[in-house]
Interface confidence: medium
């Protein structure tokens, strides 16, 4: 009897949908795996007789529930199927947006770039999929614990009247208000303000 794959899960970030599993202990030799998806009531092969422990399902429709399954195989034997259900639009993790930060005197000018979606048009981003897409921005004075959160209305924001010659850190994440779903924070970007332009030099 061939044991089934273990720890079967979907690792999905920005609709890059990778079905992952672990190979069970099997004394007779190396196992191969076949992964399938349900399409119009028929299971279709996606990865056949692979020695890998993952299979890319990024081409699935983003909407609706998908049934995926994987089994282990050895020679003419095979394990039972292990099934999981996956809804990309609900289950994918929203990766961190990009952010460009520019210092102008005592202001930080920020531009946000929604995460790109692989296997789509070059310009296709998470914003194209989620109508309610918005950004959460948080910023703080470097070295302090107090954080300030804002929700920009657009793909850019300006933090004005900051303390001069002070380093501020900023990070951004995607947020879907209608789903109350937040994405991953970007890495903090820290920049030092310069002089206050209203002060004569």
């Amino acid at each position: 009897m061939v044991p089934p794959p273990e720890n079967v899960r979907m690792n999905s970030v920005n609709f890059k949908n990778i079905l992952q599993w672990e190979s069970p202990a099997f004394a007779k030799g190396n196992l191969t795996f076949t992964a399938q998806y349900l399409s119009y009531r028929i299971f279709q092969d996606k990865c056949m007789n692979t020695t890998l422990t993952e299979c890319d399902f990024s081409s699935l429709s983003k909407y609706g529930d998908h049934t995926l399954r994987v089994r282990a195989e050895f020679a003419d034997e095979h394990s039972d199927w292990v099934n999981i259900t996956f809804c990309p639009v609900d289950d994918t993790i929203i990766g961190p947006p990009g952010m460009q930060v520019e210092v102008l005197a005592d202001s930080l000018h920020m531009r946000f770039l929604a995460p790109k979606i692989e296997n789509e048009y070059e310009t296709w981003t998470m914003k194209n999929v989620y109508n309610s897409w918005t950004y959460n921005v948080q910023y703080w004075k470097n070295g302090t614990d107090e954080k300030f959160q804002i929700t920009p209305q657009y793909d850019f924001e300006v933090l004005r009247n900051l303390e001069p010659w002070t380093t501020y850190c900023v990070q951004v994440r995607g947020f879907l208000p209608d789903r109350n779903k937040a994405g991953e924070w970007s890495e903090p970007v820290c920049e030092q303000t310069t002089h206050d332009e209203t002060v004569p030099s």
């Epitope: 899960r9 690792n11 929203i94 990070q171 991953e184």
Partner: nanobody
């Protein structure tokens, strides 16, 4: 420098429950992932559970699925591990770990960048 403070370990009879807490301090950026791993004497480290703080998505090792629950309080930068129906084989030092990088939900927590000092959990039969 990130500091992690674990608490809630102790000794319990088989079938009992414990709740571990892990608080992140001394870091100004928000945590993306928090998790727990454990190490028993003479055994390899084992990832136990992880949580993505954004959506609250969770992932568990097969050995604890259905018995352990990971949760988080983002406002307090704290993660919790509720451990029910404990077994003697759950005896180990439990470590909290956090990371600020992306795409780590299915990685064992011992691969995370920052780890705590650990708290002992002992389950007797």
């Amino acid at each position: 420098q990130v500091q992690l403070q674990e608490s809630g370990g102790g000794s319990v009879q088989a079938g009992g429950s414990l709740r571990l807490s892990c608080t992140v301090s001394r870091y100004t950026a928000s945590v993306n992932y928090m998790g727990w791993f454990r190490q028993a004497p003479g055994k390899e480290r084992e990832g136990v559970a992880t949580i993505f703080t954004g959506a609250g998505t969770t992932y568990y090792a097969n050995s604890v699925k259905g018995r352990f629950t990971i949760s988080r309080d983002n406002a307090k930068n704290t993660a919790y591990l509720q451990m029910n129906s404990l077994k003697p084989e759950d005896t180990a030092i439990y470590y909290c770990a956090v990371d600020f990088r992306g795409g780590l939900l299915y990685r064992p927590a011992y691969e995370y960048t920052y780890r705590g000092q650990g708290t002992q959990v002992t389950v007797s039969s």
